[in-house]
Each structure stands twice: as C-alpha cells, then as structure tokens.
C-alpha cells in the first residue's frame, strides 16, 4: 500500500444478545502491526482508488509485500447480568487501521465492511469483538451487531450473520494474523 502508517506504539462464546459493553479507558491495552489473511491464505489488501480506500481479498504474488494493519486492543467490561452474579468478564475488542486516520467499520445496513476516515473517539462500528478459533485463527464480531462477523464473500470483505447454535469455525469468517 502506498501510504505510510504513523504507528503510535503504547507501552503497554459470542456477545450475549442485548449485552451492554463499555470500553474501559480510551487507551488500548496493547497494539500490534500485522498482516491479515484468510483461512485459505489469501491476503487482505487495501488500495487507494478515487480518493477512497478499497478492500480486496486476493492471492499475492510471492515477491509482493503484505499490507500491514494496526490492531488496537481494548478491554471492555462484560457485566454478567444474565446470571445476576455481577461477575465482570472482559471482552477483548479490536480496531483495525490499515493507514493513518482510516479504520475498518461495519456497515450493518449494507452488510459491508468499509474503510472510513474518522477521528477519535471512534464510533462503535469500528470496534470488533475478538474470538479465538481453531487453527490459530481469529474472528471479528461486530460490537454493534452481535452474531455478525467480518467474513469473505466474492473476494471482498462483508458482514456475515452466524447463527448462535452453529459451529463458528466456518472458514469464511476465519482470519490469520501475522506480525512477521
């Protein structure tokens, strides 16, 4: 990707329906710079076209450098209101920024994933709940729409609804993070 990212390094089951999640603190607990690829090892790339960024899912030529994304991880309190026991779980949420001032955002109306320029504090649409999966993959669940995940559809990123009772291992919502 042509633009450089100004990275400010800090020293430092599904979302229940109707749950309220408050991001604790405005600073991420940690950040990392990583390339993003699909379960099938296709790369997620970003290209500036007509003054806006497009997101592609593609096979990269061997010599082509993978685009990096700044992942900022936030803790959010997860009140255990269902059981009434008051136990606060921690939900790990992430924002993804492939270039300075641009963040991946969920467009729930269009079922799409878009890159938008925005200022902090970031909108809820830019936050995704991080899930561990098998094969050292992760999934990204929309904070604003529990049960909806970033996925791959027709060589693009899209929002994909996953049934709560289904196996969340479906390949199209699995991603690999690589810091190398």
């Amino acid at each position: 990707m042509g633009s450089s990212h100004h990275h400010h390094h800090h020293s430092s089951g599904l979302v229940p329906r109707g749950s309220h999640m408050s991001i604790t603190g405005i600073s991420p607990i940690t950040e990392s710079l990583a390339s993003l690829s699909t379960y099938n090892d296709q790369s997620i790339t970003f290209a500036l076209e007509d003054e806006s960024y497009e997101i592609y899912v593609e096979d990269l030529k061997k010599d082509k450098k993978k685009d990096k994304v700044l992942l900022s991880y936030y803790e959010s309190q997860h009140p255990s209101s269902e059981s009434g026991d008051g136990v606060d779980g921690k939900m790990l949420m992430v924002t993804l920024s492939p270039t300075k001032d641009f963040w991946l955002q969920a467009n729930n109306k269009e079922h799409s994933v878009e890159l938008h320029k925005c200022e902090k504090p970031l909108p809820d649409q830019a936050f995704f709940v991080l899930h561990n999966r098998s094969f050292n993959c992760v999934s990204f669940e929309c904070k604003t729409d529990p049960g909806v995940f970033i996925g791959v559809k027709d060589n693009h990123l899209a929002l994909i609804k996953v049934d709560y009772s289904e196996n969340l291992g479906s390949e199209n919502i699995l991603f690999k993070l690589s810091e190398t």
């Epitope: 089951g13 599904l14 940690t30 269902e82 939900m91 790990l92 991080l130 561990n132 009772s165 291992g169």
Partner: antibody, heavy 122, light 107 residues
Framework: EVQLVESGGGLVQPGGSLRLSCAAS????????MSWVRQAPGKGLEWVSS????????NYADSVKGRFTISRDNSKNTLFLEMNSLRAEDTAVYYC???????????????WGQGTLVTVSS | DIQMTQSPSSVSASVGDRVTITCRAS??????LAWYQQKPGKAPKLLIY???SLQSGVPSRFSGSGSGTYFTLTISSLQPEDFATYYC?????????FGGGTKVEIK
C-alpha cells in the same frame, strides 16, 4: 462467587480411559472459553485443551491430540475431558480453568479449580 | 510451538526485597503474556495479563512489562505471602505454553 469443581480423577491402567468433569457456577458459563491445564507431580504447568463458549471451536496440545476430547454442556454448566489410550506420562493434577476474556484465551486464565489427580500406572 | 524460557529457576530473597523474574519467548508474542503465582498444593492465581495489566484484586507491588520476546515480572517489595512459584504463559497462539517456573524462596 465463581467456582470450578473438578471430578473424575483416579487410578487407571495404561491404555485405559477416564472422563473428567468440571462443574462451574457463579458466572455465565456459556459466554466463556474454558480450558484444561495439567501439572505432573513436582513439575510445571502444561496446557491441554481449550473450547469456545458454544463448543464450536476446540484446540489441543500435540501430546494429547487424537486421544483426548474436550466438550461442554452449557445447559448443565459443565466442562468435560474424555481421556483415552492413557499413558504413564499423562499422570498429573488436571485443572479446569476459565478464561479472563469471554471469547478469547489471549488474556490468560482468571479462575482455576482445585484440580483432580489422574494416576496412570499398572 | 513457542518455547517460554524463565529465569532464574529459583531466587532466594528477604522480605522487603525487590525481585525481578524474566521470561523470553522463542518468537514474538506481541503483549499476549500472563503471569501466575502458585503455592504448594494450590491452583495457580492470575497476577498479570496482556504483559502489564494488573488483574483485579492483585496487590500493586506486582507489575509486568515487556513486549515481543522479552518480559519481566517485578515484585517491588517482597511480602511473606509472596514466597511461591511464578509462571509465565504465552497466550498469543496455540498450543498455549508456560515457562518452567521460578521459585521464590526465603533467604
């Protein structure tokens, strides 16, 4: 108060089987990744297996892959570890552990059971 | 698999001492490292997560730092209840792996 209580340990011959259970209470069990971690007598900690909140994703240590199966019954707030083809080197205290993060193991394990001893010997 | 190497394997110290334990990962793990304390016959207790975040209820004399491959756990002023074995654990990728442990003993 969060409680994790393991059961099912005991003495078993090499090649035998055991099923460990972990009864959970005090938190919304189905929301959390759960794991098994073991500790051989006088040794360090070894992660065994993890399972996602809905049971859809599982991960295993290479040393137990194909022999152990992790599962959960969210209606009964119970975690299981089915252990087959047991070997002497599986002898350990087995701990059930709750992830600090609801949907991820990235934050470590904040609650552990008291452990149940599995002894594999002839 | 990611190997976690802890040092020292044991340390003798007195109440009030500052104790530092190090943990090295065989490859980068970002900040996905946890520290645990274990006393004989008991289950481990989470002290630090995400390399430097103090777990709720843990005294502030415990602190963690580091990222990538090098991490430290520091006890600023050792208390009698701190004599125990300490383990680091990488949480970056499966299989999750622990360091070999550091036993903090009374001098």
């Amino acid at each position: 108060e969060v409680q994790l209580v393991e059961s099912g340990g005991g003495l078993v011959q090499p090649g035998g089987s055991l099923r460990l259970s972990c009864a959970a209470s005090g938190f919304t069990f189905s929301s959390y990744v759960m794991s098994w971690v073991r500790q051989a007598p006088g040794k360090g900690l070894e992660w065994v297996s993890s399972i996602s909140g809905n049971g859809g994703s599982t991960n295993y240590a290479d040393s137990v892959k194909g022999r152990f199966t992790i599962s959960r019954d969210n209606s009964k707030n119970t975690l299981f570890l089915e252990m087959n083809s047991l070997r002497a080197e599986d002898t350990a205290v087995y701990y059930c552990a709750k992830s600090l993060g609801t949907t991820t193991t990235f934050l470590g394990f904040d609650y552990w059971g008291q452990g149940t001893l599995v002894t594999v010997s002839s | 698999d990611i190997q976690m190497t802890q040092s020292p394997s044991s340390v003798s110290a007195s109440v009030g001492d500052r104790v530092t334990i190090t943990c090295r990962a065989s490859q980068g793990i970002s900040s996905w490292l946890a520290w645990y304390q274990q006393k004989p016959g008991k289950a481990p207790k989470l002290l630090i997560y995400a390399a430097s975040s103090l777990q709720s209820g843990v005294p502030s004399r415990f602190s963690g730092s580091g990222s990538g491959t090098y991490f430290t756990l520091t006890i600023s002023s050792l208390q009698p209840e701190d004599f125990a074995t300490y383990y680091c654990q990488q949480a970056n990728s499966f299989p999750l792996t622990f360091g070999g442990g550091t036993k903090v003993e009374i001098k």
